[in-house]
């Protein structure tokens, strides 16, 4: 059996100011079963930007009905982008694990890029 | 607006113990990094420990196997538990939020450490 | 673990002036270098970081500059307020995080 993919099509992402930007992401395998997050950043600072299982992000919606069995996309829309939001997204994976889950693998990552809004 | 306040400062003896906190608001804790970062009297800031937002956590080789760095996102709360405390220890401890890049984008007022004998 | 060795110790200058700052690292950071301002009794406050991008409401008189190993932060026009002790932080993805030993900004 091939070992689960991790996804993101598109290496950079431009937006303008005040508009929504999709980050695709999508997963070649339902196994190992666990999570996934979003997160700018890959280093130990990396910000939490979706959590499959919880927390509180209300400018994330997800593209597809994560909870819809056999769902192997886990795009993401941010709403009203800002520049601050500028950096690199990484898709990520965990394998469910006790008494935490275990990262098991990350896409590559997207690059967001913020343009001015059109005046 | 963002606030860092650390409390649990002190004056303890070599060797003893001692637990610091950190109460954040202003920002969604969970989301983001957190760091303790020390400075001694009139020296420049020395990174201590960092708790990432998936609970991994790193530290300084000077405090590693002493200090526990920990969060509790229910609470919006950093700790740091000092142990086996040095003369060496003796600083102003700064909680600071992380961002993504891994700057310090803000930092609390600090708490004063004082290990003496 | 990198080392970073900022000169010059102590910078005394008048108002007006420009002050120039360097920082440099024992092995290459890229352009992860930030920039912070130190005032007696208050934390560190971040200027600078990327080398060269303005931390938000940094006036633009402070810029920074450089790659590798070689940095230099310069403050165009010195005004009273900026009297200070300024560190720099290489700020890669991984700890250990380290910061020079600081310059210490006078105005004379």
């Known amino acids: 059996e091939d070992e689960l993919q991790v996804i993101q099509p598109e290496k950079s992402v431009s937006v303008a100011a005040g508009e929504s930007a999709t980050l695709r992401c999508a997963m070649t395998s339902l196994i190992p079963v666990g999570p996934i997050m979003w997160f700018r950043g890959a280093g130990a600072g990396r910000e939490l930007i979706y959590n499959q299982k919880e927390g509180h992000f209300p400018r994330v919606t997800t593209v597809s009905e994560l909870t819809k069995r056999n769902n192997l996309d886990f795009s993401i829309s941010i709403s009203n982008i800002t520049p601050a939001d500028a950096g690199t997204y990484y898709c990520v994976k965990f394998r469910k694990g006790s008494p935490d889950d275990v990262e098991f693998k990350s896409g590559a990552g997207t690059e967001l890029s913020v343009r001015a809004k059109p005046s | 607006d963002v606030q860092l306040v650390e409390s649990g400062g002190g004056v303890v003896r070599p060797g003893e113990s001692l637990r610091l906190s950190c109460a954040a608001s202003?920002?969604?804790?969970?989301?983001?990094?957190m760091t303790w970062v020390r400075q001694a009297p009139g020296k420049g800031p020395e990174w201590v420990s960092l708790v990432s937002v998936t609970a991994t956590t790193y530290y300084a080789d000077s405090v590693k196997g002493r200090f526990t760095i920990s969060r509790d996102n229910s609470k919006s709360t950093l700790y740091l538990q000092m142990n086996s405390l040095r003369a060496e220890d003796t600083a102003v401890y700064y909680c600071a939020k992380i961002t993504w890049n891994n700057l310090f984008d803000y930092w609390g007022l600090g708490t004063l450490v004082t290990v003496s004998s | 673990e990198i080392v970073l060795t900022q000169s010059p110790g102590t910078l005394s200058l008048s108002p007006g002036e420009r002050a120039t700052l360097s920082c440099r690292a024992s092995q290459t950071v890229g352009s992860k270098l930030a920039w912070y301002q130190q005032k007696p009794g208050q934390a560190p406050r971040l200027l600078i970081y990327d080398s060269s991008s303005r931390a938000s409401g940094i006036p633009d008189r402070f810029s920074g500059s450089g790659s590798g190993t070689d940095f230099t932060l310069t403050i165009s026009s010195l005004q009273s307020e900026d009297s200070a002790v300024y560190y720099c932080?290489?700020?890669?993805?991984?700890?250990?995080?380290?910061f020079g030993g600081g310059t210490k900004v006078e105005i004379k």
């Open positions: 932080q290489q700020h890669n993805d991984w700890p250990p995080y380290t």
């Open positions: 202003g920002f969604t804790f969970s989301n983001f990094a």
